[in-house]
């Protein structure tokens, strides 16, 4: 390891730090509407929160940015929460020949860390 | 695809938008200097910029949470700028038996994408 | 409580029709797809279909295309399977099983409904 | 000839470890997950393990699930006579849509 540890309770408090949280999206929202049919509205986990110093570090290069940040914050961005991983969807969608289904492995994200 | 197209032109101006940028960084920057002996400073490249909506979308996930950061700014964070590929980097570092090499696969970013 | 009900036994004769129901309860009705599948005696699962409710759209295993109609009422929370010429190798427990939240597997089923076909 | 291949049948001693394996290919268990079902004697599927490794509330930890590459598969520790019954691994498919495995009959000796 890079002698640098990652932390996983939250310094700003409960919920404040990078999470996972469900948006309820209709697919006029996301502009789907004409070409996916089913479901109608989309359950999207996806992640939020800030990412204090050394929380939820994503790997090595997280843990620098989050040390370089602190010594030059103008010139080197705070880490950010983004998806570790992502569970798949099946959506019911349009095709010239009629309806079919296909899955998408990257549209939900399943958890979150800072990177 | 999701019917939404990434672009790779920046809308708000040159050197604005997510993109990889070589930060100077010294083995104290780092809080290294009691185990990595070589090299004394490194190059660090790193991710930063601003991902307006659809530039650089690293999937699905991210093309969708720009849309919605569009109509719900305040629930949904913009995606944001980070590694979409690292390049290997070695360190030589002390050990018990003396000196070794290590090889590190997550300390440089060598691309970037917004997620 | 999550809960799907289906319709009570069949014996039938080949060349008959036949539709058998699955009702919901205890959850949104059109929020979660329904699918059919099929295990014959003494045999595996083999998945036939699925429906979403809230738009009757409709998708089929190609192994079942033009086999089977399914189709929902919506009204009144249920769902359909059906035959409109039975024959003898359409004789297996029948179940419905509501979709998990994305879609990639079932969380719920039915009590099934066993179809014989028999001259 | 189903698109998961599982083994007929196990089986195990109470109180033993046993498991239970689902093969498949890169167009189904290698692009996405696996859930397991339990079929008791006589009764409908129950949703035993889903995407991979995930456990529905009420279904004890003795029961895990695991995905490696094109295969899966349901481990079952502290084996109890309840646990006599056929399992069923489920995937997606490119080509079917939703596939399952032929179905282990797991039968728990003594």
């Known amino acids: 390891s890079a002698h640098l540890h990652p932390r996983d309770s939250c310094p700003l408090g409960p919920g404040r730090c990078c999470h996972l949280e469900t948006v309820q999206a209709t697919l006029e929202d996301l502009g789907w509407s004409d070409w996916v049919l089913s479901p109608r509205q989309l359950q999207l986990s996806m992640c939020v929160g800030e990412c204090p110093h050394l929380y939820r570090s994503a790997n090595t290069h997280a843990l620098i940015k989050a040390r370089l940040h602190g010594l030059q914050p103008d010139r080197v961005p705070a880490p950010c929460c983004v998806p570790s991983s992502y569970t798949p969807v099946v959506l019911m969608h349009r095709t010239d020949s009629g309806v079919s289904l296909q899955t998408y492995d990257d549209l939900v994200a399943q958890g979150c860390h800072c990177a | 695809s999701a019917h939404l197209h990434p672009r790779d032109s920046c809308p708000l101006g040159p050197g604005r938008c997510c993109h990889l940028e070589t930060v100077q960084a010294t083995l104290e920057d780092l809080g290294w200097s009691d185990w990595v002996l070589s090299p004394r400073q490194l190059q660090l490249s790193m991710c930063v910029g601003e991902c307006p909506h659809l530039y650089r979308s690293a999937n699905t996930h991210a093309l969708i949470k720009a849309r919605l950061h569009g109509l719900q700014p305040d629930r949904v964070p913009a995606p944001c700028c980070v590694p979409s590929s690292y390049t290997p980097v070695v360190l030589m570092h002390r050990t018990d038996s003396g000196v070794s090499l290590q090889t590190y696969d997550d300390l440089v970013a060598q691309g970037c994408h917004c997620a | 409580e999550v809960q799907l009900v289906q319709s009570g036994a069949e014996v039938k004769k080949p060349g008959e029709s036949l539709k058998i129901s699955c009702k919901g309860s205890?959850?949104?009705?059109?929020?979660?797809?329904i699918g059919w599948v099929r295990q014959m005696p003494g045999k595996g699962l083999e998945w036939m279909g699925v429906i979403d409710p809230s738009g009757s759209y409709t998708i089929y295993s190609p192994s079942f295309q033009g086999q089977v109609t399914i189709s929902a009422d919506k009204s009144i929370s249920t769902a359909y399977l059906q035959w409109s010429s039975l024959k003898a190798s359409d004789t297996a427990m029948y179940y419905c099983?509501?979709?998990?939240?994305?879609?990639?597997?079932?969380?719920?089923w039915g009590q099934g409904t066993l179809v014989t076909v028999s001259s | 000839q189903s698109v998961l291949t599982q083994p007929p049948s196990v089986s195990g001693a109470p109180g033993q470890r046993v498991t239970i394996s689902c093969s498949g290919s890169?167009?189904?268990?290698?692009?996405?997950?696996v859930n397991w079902y339990q079929q008791l004697p006589g009764t409908a599927p129950k949703l035993l393990i889903y995407s991979n490794d995930n456990r529905p509330s009420g279904v004890p930890d003795r029961f895990s699930g695991s995905k490696s590459g094109t295969s899966a598969s349901l481990a079952i520790t502290g084996l109890q006579a309840e646990d006599e019954a056929d399992y069923y691994c489920q995937s997606w498919d490119s080509s079917s849509n939703y596939v399952f495995g032929g179905g282990t009959k797991l039968t728990v000796l003594g």
């Open positions: 099983a509501r979709y998990g939240r994305y879609g990639t597997y079932f969380d719920y």
């Open positions: 890169s167009s189904n268990i290698g692009v996405l997950y």
């Open positions: 205890g959850y949104s009705f059109t929020s979660y797809w």
